[in-house]
Interface confidence: low
């Protein structure tokens, strides 16, 4: 999916109001310095591409992020503010309906969510911070 035509400010607002807090809740009890950020992005569409990949694509050692609250809200924000995004995600939605109960959070998942926090920070990075 090409994220170029998303309403970035609306997505930013969704992140600031809820998604960021859910990410912090997920990472609670983890030191902010525990993981080094190895994933980055160069502009807002690129950031959303990386965020989608890390949030919804299962990886070795961390298959369950798509079931987390922050992931649900991320999916909703993208569906609402990125034209045509929902249509590309039908298969992913069907797969999520079959979800099991959440497993124990693995260190790999914590590391992945730490990377997500960094990507979201990059996405929201203002030219001039808002008061």
């Amino acid at each position: 999916y090409d994220f170029t035509n998303c309403d970035f400010e609306k997505i930013k607002a969704a992140y600031l109001s809820t998604i960021s807090k859910d990410l912090i809740t997920y990472m609670s009890g983890t030191k902010s310095t525990e993981f080094n950020n190895t994933v980055s992005c160069s502009n807002r569409p690129h950031c959303l591409t990386e965020i989608q990949s890390l949030t919804f694509n299962p990886t070795a050692g961390c298959a369950s992020l798509a079931k987390e609250m922050f992931a649900m809200k991320t999916k909703a924000a993208l569906a609402i503010w990125c034209p045509g995004y929902s249509e590309t995600q039908i298969n992913a939605t069907q797969a999520m309906k079959k979800r099991r109960k959440r497993k124990v959070t693995t260190n790999k998942c914590l590391e992945q969510v730490s990377q997500l926090q960094g990507l979201w920070r990059r996405f929201n990075r203002p030219l001039l911070k808002q008061q």
């Epitope: 160069s42 920070r121 990075r125 030219l127 001039l128 808002q130 008061q131």
Partner: antibody
């Protein structure tokens, strides 16, 4: 190994010109904004100029505007600073500096050269 | 253009906490970066975007920024931390990078 190496410094008389160069290696030079920063002997850091990653924009400190010109050659991984109408107050160590670029804002300087000394004296 | 004000010097005993401030009009609205410079060496980035720490910078270094003051805090200060420290912001109004005057940290 990521590296920035400055050259071209030296002693020059007031009113004359000097051209500094900076050779970059070990990273994707064309994707970074590049700056010159200077430091007069015993003084603090002073930002001089920036050129965007693609050369599309340049900005200068008021103290050098109209006298200094920053350019880059992405095919050769080089940064240049053409300094004209030099003054005694331009005497300083000149650092070539790399900064990731985010939209149109300049970011923190994450890689510095070791600097080249420019002395303007009669 | 935008002005950043730092105290010329700060002294602290080994093992104590050093606090270096950087004042500017509504500096909390800007992203602040901090550099360490030891004699005869090029500066090194120690804190960027107010609070983030580059790899290889000890956890003892931290930053904060709100209102009219940004702060660099060095906990459990060591002799090797003795250096000049500079704050920096990008001034979007004038498209210029601005440095503070620098603070000399002395470890007693």
């Amino acid at each position: 190994q990521m590296q920035l190496v400055e050259s071209g410094g030296g002693v020059v008389q007031p009113g004359r010109s000097l051209r500094l160069s900076c050779a970059a290696s070990g990273f994707a030079f064309r994707t970074y904004g590049m700056h010159w920063v200077r430091q007069a002997p015993g003084k603090g850091l002073e930002w001089v100029a920036v050129i965007w990653y693609d050369g599309s924009a340049t900005h200068y400190a008021d103290s050098v505007k109209g006298r200094f010109t920053i350019t880059r050659d992405n095919s050769k991984n080089t940064l240049n600073l053409q300094m004209n109408s030099l003054r005694a107050e331009d005497t300083a160590v000149y650092y070539c500096v790399r900064a990731p670029q985010w939209y149109l804002s300049a970011e923190a300087f994450d890689l510095w050269g070791q600097g080249t000394m420019v002395t303007v004296s009669s | 253009s935008y002005v950043l004000t730092q105290p010329p010097s700060v002294s602290v005993a080994p093992g104590e906490t050093a606090t270096i401030t950087c004042g500017g009009n509504l500096i909390g609205a800007y992203l602040v970066h901090w550099y360490q410079q030891k004699p005869g060496q090029a500066p090194v980035l120690v804190i960027y975007d107010d609070v983030d720490r580059p790899a290889r910078i000890p956890e003892r270094f931290s930053g904060s920024n709100s209102g009219n003051t940004a702060t660099l805090t060095i906990s459990r200060v060591e002799a090797g931390d003795e250096a000049d420290y500079y704050c920096q912001v990008w001034d979007h109004d004038t498209n210029t990078m601005v440095f503070g005057g620098g603070t000399k940290l002395t470890v007693l």
